[in-house]
């Protein structure tokens, strides 16, 4: 799997999409997990509804939400109020039994808000009471890592 880069602006919402073959993954629940190190496990962040026929319902865990268009074959993850600590490597997964297939490897990059001059009065941050439906979703910038780019750069 190539890694697809999604860039979002700090404080805004980032939408990550993972297309898949709807017939191949028919009946399978999906998940979004965070990769812990190059060879480490992928830690589950949020998964779709327990009942596959209700996968289109938005499920959330903290500031992360997931919804699955099972007929169209697109898994969508929304990271709300993006923060620097959200940057890192993730996976979209298709679950079957205790196994998980990787649908897409994702690198989330968090860009500094160009309008942020550290004047909190000018900065809009979604409040806790605001729903995902109300949150502004920034159109994400995405690209695949070029051949030769190292997804996990060696640590010094």
């Amino acid at each position: 799997h190539n890694t697809t880069v999604f860039q979002g602006v700090e404080g805004q919402s980032l939408q990550v999409s993972c297309p898949y073959d709807s017939m191949k993954h028919w009946g399978r629940r999906k998940a979004w997990c965070r990769q812990l190190g190059e060879k480490g496990p992928c830690q589950r962040v949020v998964s779709t509804h327990n009942l596959w026929l209700l996968s289109f319902l938005r499920r959330r865990n903290g500031s992360t939400a997931i919804t699955d268009d099972t007929l169209g074959g697109t898994l969508t993850i929304t990271l709300r109020n993006l923060q620097p600590h959200d940057a890192g490597f993730y996976q979209c997964q298709s679950l079957h039994g205790s196994e998980a297939d990787t649908l897409r490897k994702v690198l989330v990059e968090v860009l500094a808000d160009p309008l942020d001059h550290r004047d909190a009065g000018d900065l809009w941050v979604p409040g806790e009471s605001e729903s995902f439906e109300d949150a502004h979703v920034e159109h994400s910038i995405s690209r695949s890592l070029l051949e030769g780019e190292i997804p996990f750069p060696p640590t010094s």
Epitope: W52, L53, L57, R60, L71
Partner: antibody, heavy 126, light 106 residues
Framework: EVQLVESGGGLVQPGRSLRLSCTAS????????MSWFRQAPGKGLEWVGF??????????EYTASVKGRFTISRDGSKSIAYLQMNSLKTEDTAVYYC?????????????????WGQGTMVTVSS | DIQMTQSPSSLSASVGDRVTITCQAS??????LNWYQQKPGKAPKLLIY???NLETGVPSRFSGSGSGTDFTFTISSLQPEDIATYYC????????FGGGTKVEIK
Amino acid sequence: EVQLVESGGGLVQPGRSLRLSCTASGFTFGDYAMSWFRQAPGKGLEWVGFIGSKAYGGTTEYTASVKGRFTISRDGSKSIAYLQMNSLKTEDTAVYYCARGKRRDYGYWHPAFDVWGQGTMVTVSS
Amino acid sequence: DIQMTQSPSSLSASVGDRVTITCQASQDITNYLNWYQQKPGKAPKLLIYDASNLETGVPSRFSGSGSGTDFTFTISSLQPEDIATYYCQEYDQYLTFGGGTKVEIK
């Protein structure tokens, strides 16, 4: 008139089988998810399972207590949903209702059930 | 699994009274909650979906509110035809009903 009519209930011995039918009329049957619920005498409502609309090709979901014993199916040409109940237990005794899942504006359905049948009684006893 | 706790289990009120029923989920279910009315010997009837949306054709004296774990169903002015048992139903995890609230007229 939009209507659902259940049939097939009755008295059955433990371990035996029974098939319930839910005949729909007044709406485009294939466009809707269909569900079965039950209510034991003097008790509350319990979801049994449901089957997706035609677009979902007969995909089903069940509550844990009936999984492997009950099967939901649908016949689009007859506008009938079925509940096949095998290996029946005394605790399956209940009034069984079929119901239609509400449709959402943007094409998906909603797990709120806006049309219900009158119910059919199933008694499992030796 | 989520537990749905409805209270009270029964109540008696006069015609014209405001009646309130609560439903508490054992964990956050956002607004994934419906309310049904079931009259004796009859099938359930959908009244409220998504916690607060009134089903088409349902009288406006019925309303629902809440999100997260705590939900409220209200009959603003109780009518004789409202004698029934009322159930909440979550759909965040599976499809689980509350135990029901039986409403009677004093």
